[in-house]
Amino acid sequence: APVRSLNCTLRDSQQKSLVMSGPYELKALHLQGQDMEQQVVFSMSFVQGEESNDKIPVALGLKEKNLYLSCVLKDDKPTLQLESVDPKNYPKKKMEKRFVFNKIEINNKLEFESAQFPNWYISTSQAENMPVFLGGTKGGQDITDFTMQFVSS
């Protein structure tokens, strides 16, 4: 069976949108009006992994690009990157673990925990125009809560 996907945008709990910053980086900043068209549209795929009532495993690709968010060790630290893949083979139901995020739904907010690195989350900074990154703390200064907006195909 083909993997199921839907198109969406994400905003952090401070309403910052995610945009491309160079070919392999995302940054978070406040957008308004026509600038909203700059925000990244994700193709969220529902993949194989540990699932519970609050937790659904997903992969986050950039719509119509062969780029996926992935989690790897760099200098011994879990790091978020945009990784290029062969579009003939992706997305697939059984994604490699580095591409898998546990989408956790709590009080109408979403967290995206790395399946590869438990307790590390897609994060944004309080500051404007800073890179989206993988953070190892929740409830601190950095933002780990998001909302999802569905986008028609």
């Epitope: 069976a1 199921r4 529902f46 194989q48 699932e51 009532n53 659904i56 739904e105 999802m148």
Partner: nanobody
Framework: EVQLLESGGGLVQPGGSLRLSCAAS????????MGWVRQAPGKGLEWVSS????????YYADSVKGRFTISRDDSKNTLYLQMNSLRAEDTAVYYC????????????????WGQGTLVTVSS
């Protein structure tokens, strides 16, 4: 043409049991995640349970966990839902859904669903 035909519903007393079946045809059953959703009178659709292709993973809504068991027999192209310790709040039309994927707590995607079978729990 995809067809899903549910059966096994009926009237049962609180604490009783029922086993629902869903006979599938028109697609390669074993390749697809399947599941059950239900609609109580005057309410919206509620996800109940899912089972992965090959049947090695099962998922349940909190409201039915420990009471309902989903299973499948790929040789018979049939999906099952064993419902035990039934409660009045389980009264609903139960639908079998093909390629059911849970997007969030309150949102699902599926390609096809059946006509449904009515389960009434009442004394």
């Amino acid at each position: 043409e995809v067809q899903l035909l549910e059966s096994g519903g009926g009237l049962v007393q609180p604490g009783g049991s029922l086993r629902l079946s869903c006979a599938a045809s028109g697609f390669t059953f074993e390749d697809y995640q399947m599941g059950w959703v239900r609609q109580a009178p005057g309410k919206g659709l509620e996800w109940v349970s899912s089972i992965s292709a090959m049947g090695n993973r099962t998922y349940y809504a909190d409201s039915v966990k420990g009471r309902f068991t989903i299973s499948r027999d790929d040789s018979k192209n049939t999906l099952y839902l064993q419902m035990n310790s039934l409660r009045a709040e389980d009264t609903a039309v139960y639908y079998c859904a093909e390629n059911l994927v849970r997007v969030s707590k309150a949102r699902w995607m599926f390609d096809y669903w059946g006509q449904g079978t009515l389960v009434t729990v009442s004394s």
